[in-house]
């Protein structure tokens, strides 16, 4: 199980001193930025127990493996469900703490109930402040059951849940009708997925026999040990004030674990620390009792004394839970509670024993989970112990589970169970990812998802040219860093594969799938220079350039012209896709803009050195359109145009341009210049009689401006065919007077 503990500090006289701390003993827990370890999360869960909103709670991280929640201002802030989430991937685990108000109408006799599948669970709510009305039981926030207030037995309302199944797990509450939710009794029911003493997918495997109140996990068969106990079967007590799977954590404060509630991963739930009991975990165990919630009885024999934290303390010459075993009885010594091996390895396992008579090689045996008994291949006999060495046949996954070392002599027998975890070496599920490439190197991300077991100790990257039969080159890299493959050939495909390893002998996994990564072309080395440029309009620029002459073929696919508009902070890129090109027309530029211009040769995706830059100023754009253009037929060959000057001119007009076109005609329009810019009238002559014409005009300063509106007018009838339109202009007033 994940080593995750949620501690609640129950100093309820002062809510502001109340805190919740989530502590992880997992390697790399809570780092967050590390790809191998997501952060610890600690929060109030308002989905089921909805209480009035309070001020936001403060979350403080203390190092990488601890997070604390503070900021409770009043007792009602504490009521409800809190959860801590830790562990990575499939081991991600949620630990839940349920807090009851000490002033509630109803109080739980016991908050956490862990039961086996098929058991009958009984939740008991004690009346603290009576109300003469119905009691409503809820399950996970939804109505479940009703009791009349007369149905209390010895001042308690009982909810019996026969034949419970895992879906019955959750938060239960007992509430008086019409009473505040803060007055409810809240419970947590945990239903193991198997019957008593069983675990595994079909509940076919036998639990190791957890001691000292440990609970067998229905998925992996491990004992979840109460706070203050450790070992595969929780057989070993921690020193007072310590907790965690390896007793590595210490209770804060001078009073040790007093006043702390400990919540552990399901199916354990919550309890006081070892040596303490009561709703606020502030009462020491009564004589003869020990352990979490003081649930265990010592029953020491042979002069043993009861310690409320660890149980029986035996006098010399005796050992065992109740000091019931004489030291003459053989005893397994210093057996590790858990061993880890990689699949298909053939490890050696040692088992040491002492006793009187002295154990010999044949008296020590090793039993696998399937019942197979292994005999030792050799034994090392020392004055105080015999160590038997067992050569284990090639391991398979089914060998995972509880193994047992057993010693038998005429003085009696002893056995010690230990857990063997057979781990599958990791195999990449995906190919490595190409990050960047150059002509002679590839930068690769080797971190990929994998099947099998972590942690990843080493990553090997194997690579060789595609379709090559030469040996693979190998580079060993750090799992969390990107790798640069160097000294490669340009424009060459390489087959690249990842191999992952986990710790221990035989931890190397199979190679992952290959991927093809291709190095880039050679970089173009020639630096062009700009020969010249000229403006072909307010938004058009023609550019020409040259390249130095070098022997051999030109390494390049084309040119990239870059125009930098510093004022607007914009760059324009123009791709010239022929390496033979030495000129280009750039259009659609912004009139009146100062550009910095350069050119560079490219090859594949690589750019060569840029030319020295040139600075180009495009002329500004033309003026606005003339206003109120009007056409009036004067004869069968003449039409007079009148207009008003454009507004907001950027400078003096140099001329006007009139466009003349026969309405509906297919031919090109005719443009006529009006070279006297002060004019506001002109006569277009030489038109055809009885013909409809379209006119529009624009002004010019340094460039042509916008067109005016288009006007239509027809010449008068009965005239002869004209030579073609010509223009005569004079001041508008004069024209009109005539």
């Amino acid at each position: 199980a994940v080593d995750l503990t949620l501690l609640a500090n129950l100093r309820l006289t002062d809510p502001q001193r109340f805190f919740l701390t989530c502590v992880s003993g997992e390697a790399g827990a809570g780092r967050g930025s590390d790809a191998w370890g997501p952060p610890l999360l600690l929060e109030k869960d308002d989905r089921i127990v909805r209480t009035p909103p309070g001020p936001p709670l403060r979350l403080a991280r203390n190092g990488s493996h601890q997070v604390t929640l503070r900021g409770f201002s009043k007792p009602s802030d504490l009521v409800g469900v809190f959860s801590c989430v830790g562990g990575a991937g499939a081991r991600r685990t949620r630990v839940i703490y349920v807090h009851n108000s000490p002033g509630a109408h109803l109080l739980p006799d016991k908050v956490t109930h862990t039961v086996n599948k098929g058991d009958t669970a009984v939740l008991s709510a004690r009346v603290h402040k009576e109300k003469q009305t119905d009691v409503i039981w809820k399950s996970n926030g939804s109505y479940f059951y009703t009791l009349d207030w007369h149905e209390a037995q010895d001042g308690r309302f009982l909810l019996q849940l026969p034949n419970v199944q895992p879906p019955s797990s959750g938060i239960y509450s007992a509430t008086y009708l019409e009473a505040s939710p803060l007055g409810s009794a809240f419970f947590r029911l945990i239903v193991r997925g198997c019957g008593a003493g069983r675990w595994g997918p079909g509940c076919t495997k036998e639990c190791p026999g957890c001691l000292h109140g440990g609970v067998c996990h229905d998925h992996d068969g491990e004992c979840v040990c109460p706070p203050g106990f450790t070992g595969t079967r929780c057989e070993q007590a921690c020193r007072e004030g310590r907790f965690g799977q390896s007793c590595q954590e210490q209770c804060p404060g001078i009073s040790g674990c007093r006043g702390l509630t400990f919540c552990l991963p399901d199916p354990y739930g919550c309890s006081c620390g070892s040596g303490w009991r009561g709703s606020q975990c502030q009462e020491a165990c009564a004589p003869g009792h020990f352990g979490a919630d003081c649930r265990l009885q010592c029953q020491c024999q042979n002069g043993g004394t009861c310690d409320r934290f660890s149980g029986c303390v035996c006098p010399s010459g005796w050992h065992g839970v109740h000091c019931e075993k004489s030291d003459r009885i053989p005893q397994i010594l210093n057996m590790a509670s858990e061993l880890e091996f990689n699949l298909e390895t053939m490890p050696r396992i040692n088992c040491a024993a002492a006793g009187n008579p002295f154990p010999v090689r044949g008296s020590i045996e090793l039993r696998k989970p399937d019942g197979t008994v292994l005999l030792s291949t050799k034994a090392i006999v020392e004055p105080e112990k015999t160590t038997a060495e067992f050569e284990v046949p090639r391991l398979v996954l089914a060998d995972s589970g509880f193994w047992e070392c057993r010693v038998s002599t005429s003085g009696g027998q002893d056995s010690r169970r230990f857990k063997v975890n057979v781990k599958v070496p990791p195999v990449p599920l995906a190919a490595p990812r190409l990050l960047t490439k150059q002509s002679r190197q590839l930068v690769v991300s080797p971190l990929v998802s994998f099947s099998g077991d972590g942690p990843i100790s080493t990553v090997r990257l194997h690579y060789r040219p595609q379709d090559s039969t030469m040996d693979w080159s190998t580079i060993v890299v750090d799992p969390s860093e990107n790798v640069t493959l160097m000294n490669l050939r340009p424009k060459t495909g390489y087959s690249v594969r990842v191999q992952l390893s986990r710790p221990g002998e035989g931890g190397e996994g199979a190679w992952g799938p290959p991927t093809l990564m291709t190095t880039d072309c050679p970089e173009p080395l020639l630096q062009p220079w700009l020969e010249g440029w000229h403006v072909e309009g307010t938004d058009r620029l023609r550019v020409s350039w040259s390249l130095p002459l070098v022997p051999g073929p030109l390494v390049g696919d084309g040119f990239l012209l870059r125009l930098w508009d510093g004022t607007r902070g914009q760059e324009r890129r123009e791709n010239v896709s022929s390496p033979q090109a030495r000129t280009a027309l750039l259009t659609g530029l912004t009139p009146g803009t100062h550009y910095q211009l350069d050119v560079q040769l490219y090859h594949c995706t690589l750019l060569g050195p840029a030319s020295p830059p040139a600075h180009v100023l495009l002329p500004p754009s033309g003026p606005p359109a003339p206003r109120h253009l009007h056409a009036q037929a004067l004869s069968d060959s003449e039409i007079q145009l009148t207009w008003k000057h454009p507004e907001a001119l950027p400078g003096p007009i140099s001329k006007y341009v009139v466009e003349v076109q026969v309405a509906g005609g297919a031919g090109d329009p005719l443009w006529i210049d009006v070279d006297r810019p002060e004019e506001t009238s002109t006569i277009i002559r030489g038109l055809n009689a009885s013909t409809r014409y379209l006119f529009r005009m624009r002004a010019s300063i340094q460039g042509l401006g916008d067109w005016s509106n288009t006007v239509e007018e027809s010449t008068l009838g009965n005239g002869l065919q004209a030579e073609g339109p010509v223009q005569e202009s004079r001041a508008a007033e004069e024209g009109l007077d005539q």
């Epitope: 009035p52 009305t133 009703t146 009791l147 019409e178 009473a179 939710p181």
Partner: antibody, heavy 125, light 108 residues
Framework: EVQLLESGGGLVQPGGSLRLSCAAS????????MLWVRQAPGKGLEWVSS????????SYADSVKGRFTISRDNSKNTLYLQMNSLRAEDTAVYYC??????????????????WGQGTLVTVSS | QSVLTQDPAVSVALGQTVRITCQGD??????ATWYQQKPGQAPVLVIY???NRPSGIPDRFSGSSSGNTGSLTITGAQAEDEADYYC???????????FGGGTKLTVL
């Protein structure tokens, strides 16, 4: 869909007995409080009796206490009302109803949203 | 034993607003629940709690509570609202249920 169907009503002489049944469907019968309410012709509604989910607690209106017995069979999803020593004033349409519970700002409250169509009991000589 | 008291009859013009009241000591501890009953039919829940309507009940029905009095208000009464209206709560002992005597609403 919650459904309640009463049966067992009819004509009975004063001093006689009758047993009403209410068949429930569409919900988990064993989790809910049930009750009988009656309505004499042209009169208002009158609560008769309630029974809690386990059947372990019952309550009665003073007017029927000692004569009527409410019971339930959770395995058959059925509510019963055994009526003894019937009187003319027991003539009424008898409805069975189910308690419902709702959450109002965290406070749990009760109402009776689901009713049967009623069965008529006539006590007359 | 506490009782719930209602006016026997109330009338309202079509489209107008009418208020039906229910008085009793138990209403100091419990909200009134209101039921509508039309001739030959089972009662139908219309208002419960502070002012909650089951689905299907028009929003012209509303409830309120003050002291020992619960009220049912119909804003813009319709012809189909003509029916008997009953209030209900627990009695002060918490075990018995009480129904008011009913109010016959006529829509003119």
């Amino acid at each position: 869909e919650v459904q309640l169907l009463e049966s067992g009503g009819g004509l009975v002489q004063p001093g006689g007995s009758l047993r009403l049944s209410c068949a429930a469907s569409g919900f988990t019968f064993s989790q809910y409080k049930m009750l009988w309410v009656r309505q004499a012709p042209g009169k208002g509604l009158e609560w008769v009796s309630s029974i809690y989910p386990s059947g372990g607690w019952t309550s009665y209106a003073d007017s029927v206490k000692g004569r009527f017995t409410i019971s339930r069979d959770n395995s058959k999803n059925t509510l019963y009302l055994q009526m003894n020593s019937l009187r003319a004033e027991d003539t009424a349409v008898y409805y069975c109803a189910r308690a419902s519970y709702y959450d109002s700002g965290g406070y749990y409250r009760e109402n009776f949203q689901f009713w049967g169509q009623g069965t008529l009991v006539t006590v007359s000589s | 034993q506490s009782v719930l008291t209602q006016d026997p009859a109330v009338s309202v013009a079509l489209g107008q607003t009418v208020r039906i009241t229910c008085q009793g000591d138990s209403l100091r501890s419990y909200y009134a629940t209101w039921y509508q009953q039309k001739p030959g039919q089972a009662p139908v829940l219309v208002i419960y709690g502070e002012n909650n309507r089951p689905s299907g009940i028009p929003d012209r029905f509303s409830g309120s509570s003050s002291g020992n009095t619960g009220s049912l208000t119909i804003t813009g009464a319709q012809a189909e609202d003509e029916a008997d209206y009953y209030c209900n709560s627990r009695d002060t002992s918490g075990s018995h249920l009480l129904f008011g005597g009913g109010t016959k609403l006529t829509v003119l």
